[in-house]
Amino acid sequence: TTPEPCELDDEDFRCVCNFSEPQPDWSEAFQCVSAVEVEIHAGGLNLEPFLKRVDADADPRQYADTVKALRVRRLTVGAAQVPAQLLVGALRVLAYSRLKELTLEDLKITGTMPPLPLEATGLALSSLRLRNVSWATGRSWLAELQQWLKPGLKVLSIAQAHSPAFSCEQVRAFPALTSLDLSDNPGLGERGLMAALCPHKFPAIQNLALRNTGMETPTGVCAALAAAGVQPHSLDLSHNSLRATVNPSAPRCMWSSALNSLNLSFAGLEQVPKGLPAKLRVLDLSCNRLNRAPQPDELPEVDNLTLDGNPFLVPGTALPHEGSMNSGVVPAC
């Protein structure tokens, strides 16, 4: 016998479905309606036939009572080709649910998303995560998706984007967004970052993650942030191949005084980069290629400095300078 595609845990908390058959029995996912965390992976299927079975234009209020009874707070949908009209239909219905966190991964969205009807209510998400999602509409996808969401989104994560730059003139501000994660977009680069950080559309950002995004220098990132008026408290530039030196012709960039935590781990640095903020609470330089202990004049004024995993700390080589704050644990770099 073939294994059941869905599994609901004994606490009715987490339900995972992996549909791999060419013609899956979607009714198997019904057991997930009592779960808080739901994951549905559609095995790369094209969901176009669903449009024939559902009336995408039907008034979603007729499902409101049923949807309100759903316990789902976190939903992940992955591995499918989804008509935009079907996605919109799902968002309209889920607007009546208690859903707070939505993750879309390995999806191909086909067609264009219709505008939000006047009487429709947006989905009140706190977190939206997208990984390897392609949109037929190119750069305008975020603006089209945004109109189906209420303005309270706090966390936005976009990884492996086919079009990480947005059509900024169409995007509305995200007034509550405190965390923006653009990690794992290796083709983004500093110019792409300028295009993605639509000026004054992200006024509340506190945490900005740019791991593995093709960033080249902290100064270049500083310039992109300044141009966009983005002033994060915490900035993660780890897993980028960073250059320590600054192009002499590049203008000096003043970091926002709001920035107090900077992660430069796994960045291939052989020396402390120039142009860092003058004062930081946390600076992570672990797992780089520093051959000697940084001198005090090379470092910002910092409360919590991590240097673990650099060659100069490996037993048998140079000792760390006094006052460097290391955990004593050698990380797996």
Epitope: E4, E7, L8, D9, D10, E11, D12, F30, Q31, V33, S34, T66, A69, L70, R71
Partner: nanobody, 115 residues
Framework: QVQLQESGGGLVQAGGSLRLSCAAS????????MGWYRQPPGKEREMVAQ???????NYGDSVKGRFTISRGSARNTVYLQMNNLKPEDTAVYYC?????????WGQGTQVTVSS
């Protein structure tokens, strides 16, 4: 191990009604989703009706408006009220309890609708 016992099947005239019951026994520590499925002669097994642990119901297209699934007051008991029966409803009806690791199925009860 969980056992499911269906009852209430039989022979009925078209347009008539039947009520199927299913009782689960064994090691079940929480209310689980349950469902009714059927296998008409020479055909694949198909979903008839489902009910979640929080009372949400779902029906197969061919039985909507005629069949009603409900839970009993006992922890994992489920009923299927079948009205306006048609000859194409003839099948063996199985009860299913969705359970982590391995779902449990009953032995089935025969429903025959004569025209």
């Amino acid at each position: 191990q969980v056992q499911l016992q269906e009852s209430g099947g039989g022979l009925v005239q078209a347009g008539g009604s039947l009520r199927l019951s299913c009782a689960a026994s064994g090691r079940i520590f929480s209310i689980r989703p349950m469902g009714w499925y059927r296998q008409p002669p020479g055909k694949e097994r198909e979903m008839v009706a489902q009910i979640s642990s929080n009372g949400i119901t779902n029906y197969g297209d061919s039985v909507k408006g005629r069949f009603t699934i409900s839970r009993g007051s006992a922890r994992n008991t489920v009923y299927l009220q079948m009205n306006n029966l048609k000859p194409e409803d003839t099948a063996v009806y199985y009860c299913r309890l969705f359970k982590t690791g391995a779902d449990s199925w009953g032995q089935g009860t025969q429903v025959t609708v004569s025209s």
